[in-house]
C-alpha cells in the first residue's frame, strides 16, 4: 500500500516517501527503490535554511555599499547574510535593502530614542520647562536653567527652543 502521507523531514514522490535534504544542502536526486535521496552542499555564497527539496540554493544577500549597506553577519550554507547600515544611516525596511540618513530633531524637539541600524531617530516635542535650540540626531530636550539656584531671577522666559535668560535680582534702595 503506497503511503499518502510521510513522516517529518520526508516528502512524497512517485508513491514513496523520500528524505528531505538538510539545511545547507540541495536536492540532486529523489530517492528511488534502490537509492536514498541524494543531496549536495550549497556552493560558496549560497544557502538553504530549512529541510528542503530545492534543486537550487539561494544566493546570499549582497550588502551594497552604494546603498549605505554593510555586512552585519556573514551568511553560511544554512543562513542568509544579514545587512545593516553604515553609521548615521538606518534601514528603510525590515529586509534592510537600502538605507536612509537618520533624521535630526528640529529645534523645539529632542531625541526620545537614538536611531539604530534598523530604526530611525524618534523625536518628541520639548515639554514646558525644557528646550532644544539645535537640529540634532542625538540631543535630548534640556531643562531650562534654574535661575533660583544661582540666586538669579528670570529676565526672559524660556520657550521650547530657547533657554530662560537669568539676571541679577533688583536691589532694594
Amino acid at each position: 500500500e503506497p503511503p499518502t502521507a510521510c513522516r517529518e523531514k520526508q516528502y512524497l514522490i512517485n508513491s514513496q516517501c523520500c528524505s528531505l535534504c538538510q539545511p545547507g544542502q540541495k536536492l540532486v536526486s529523489d530517492c528511488t527503490e534502490f537509492t536514498e535521496t541524494e543531496c549536495l552542499p550549497c556552493g560558496e555564497s549560497e544557502f538553504l535554511d530549512t529541510w528542503n527539496r530545492e534543486t537550487h540554493c539561494h544566493q546570499h544577500k549582497y550588502c551594497d555599499p552604494n546603498l549605505g549597506l554593510r555586512v552585519q553577519q556573514k551568511g553560511t550554507s544554512e543562513t542568509d547574510t544579514i545587512c545593516t547600515c553604515e553609521e548615521g544611516w538606518h534601514c528603510t525596511s525590515e529586509a534592510c535593502e537600502s538605507c536612509v540618513l537618520h533624521r535630526s530633531c528640529s529645534p523645539g524637539f529632542g531625541v526620545k530614542q537614538i536611531a539604530t541600524g534598523v530604526s530611525d531617530t524618534i523625536c518628541e516635542p520639548c515639554p514646558v520647562g525644557f528646550f532644544s535650540n539645535v537640529s540634532s540626531a542625538f540631543e535630548k530636550c534640556h531643562p531650562w536653567t534654574s535661575c533660583e539656584t544661582k540666586d538669579l531671577v528670570v529676565q526672559q522666559a524660556g520657550t521650547n527652543k530657547t533657554d530662560v535668560v537669568c539676571g541679577p535680582q533688583d536691589r532694594l534702595r
Epitope: Q10, C17, S19, S29, T35, E36, T55
Partner: antibody, heavy 114, light 112 residues
Framework: QVQLKESGPGLVAPSQSLSITCTVS????????VHWVRQPPGKGLEWLGV???????SYNSALMSRLSISKDNSKSQVFLKMNSLQTDDTAMYYC????????WGAGTTVTVSS | DVVMTQTPLSLPVSLGDQASISCRSS???????????LHWYLQKPGQSPGLLIY???NRFSGVPDRFSGSGSGTDFTLKISRVEAEDLGVYFC?????????FGGGTKLEIK
C-alpha cells in the same frame, strides 16, 4: 525500456586522454543521473562518478583530478573524460542510470597500451 | 569512503549445495531514513553485473527464491539454498547509502 550503451576508442596510449560516450534511452537525462563504474580485467568494480539530472557532478576523490563528466540532454548522451591514462586504467567501463541499478550498459573495453 | 569486505574470495560448491557469502562494511549502511542500501549482484562470465537482491533482502523481479539476503548495520549475508549451474559466476555486494558508491571485491562461485 531503460537501455544504456557505452562507446569508446578501445585502445589508448599511456599519458593520453580517454573519451567515452554513454547513450541512454527509456529515460530522460533531465530527470535522472548517470553513474560511471569500471572493472579492471579479473578484478572488482570501482565507482568513478555521477552526473546528476541538474548537471551537478560527484567524483571518486582518488580520480577527481583527472576525471570529468558532462552531458548533452538533447542527445541523451553522457560523456566521461579521463586524462593521463596509465596501464592500470585498463578496464571495462560501464554506465548506469541512477535508480536503475538493474540496468547496466554492456560496457566498453579500454586498453591502455603503447 | 565505505570499504566493503567480501568473504570468501572463492567458493567451490557442489550443485545442489547451499552457499553463503559474507559482506562487511567499514561503517553502518543504515541511512537516517532507516533504509539500508546494500545490494547483491551476480556477474556471469562475459556479462555486465545483474541485480539479484536490493536493500538487504528484497529479491529483484525474476530472481529465483533460492536466493536470499539478510543482515543489518555492517554485516550482511547472501545465501543460495540449492546451487544450480546457472548460478556460477562472481557475486558482488554494493552499497549506495553513501556517495561514493562502493563494491565488495567479489566472490567467485565455482564447481567443486
Amino acid at each position: 525500456q531503460v537501455q544504456l550503451k557505452e562507446s569508446g576508442p578501445g585502445l589508448v596510449a599511456p599519458s593520453q586522454s580517454l573519451s567515452i560516450t554513454c547513450t541512454v534511452s527509456g529515460f530522460s537525462l533531465t530527470s535522472s543521473g548517470v553513474h560511471w563504474v569500471r572493472q579492471p580485467p579479473g578484478k572488482g568494480l570501482e565507482w568513478l562518478g555521477v552526473i546528476w539530472a541538474g548537471g551537478d557532478t560527484s567524483y571518486n576523490s582518488a580520480l577527481m583530478s583527472r576525471l570529468s563528466i558532462s552531458k548533452d540532454n538533447s542527445k541523451s548522451q553522457v560523456f566521461l573524460k579521463m586524462n593521463s591514462l596509465q596501464t592500470d586504467d585498463t578496464a571495462m567501463y560501464y554506465c548506469l542510470g541512477h535508480g536503475h541499478l538493474d540496468v547496466w550498459g554492456a560496457g566498453t573495453t579500454v586498453t591502455v597500451s603503447s | 569512503d565505505v570499504v566493503m569486505t567480501q568473504t570468501p574470495l572463492s567458493l567451490p560448491v557442489s550443485l545442489g549445495d547451499q552457499a553463503s557469502i559474507s559482506c562487511r562494511s567499514s561503517q553502518s549502511l543504515v541511512h537516517s531514513s532507516g533504509n539500508t542500501y546494500l545490494h547483491w549482484y551476480l556477474q556471469k562470465p562475459g556479462q555486465s553485473p545483474g541485480l539479484l537482491i536490493y536493500k538487504v533482502s528484497n529479491r529483484f523481479s525474476g530472481v529465483p527464491d533460492r536466493f536470499s539476503g539478510s543482515g543489518s548495520g555492517t554485516d550482511f549475508t547472501l545465501k543460495i539454498s540449492r546451487v544450480e549451474a546457472e548460478d556460477l559466476g562472481v557475486y558482488f555486494c554494493s552499497q549506495t547509502t553513501h556517495v561514493p558508491w562502493t563494491f565488495g571485491g567479489g566472490t567467485k562461485l565455482e564447481i567443486k
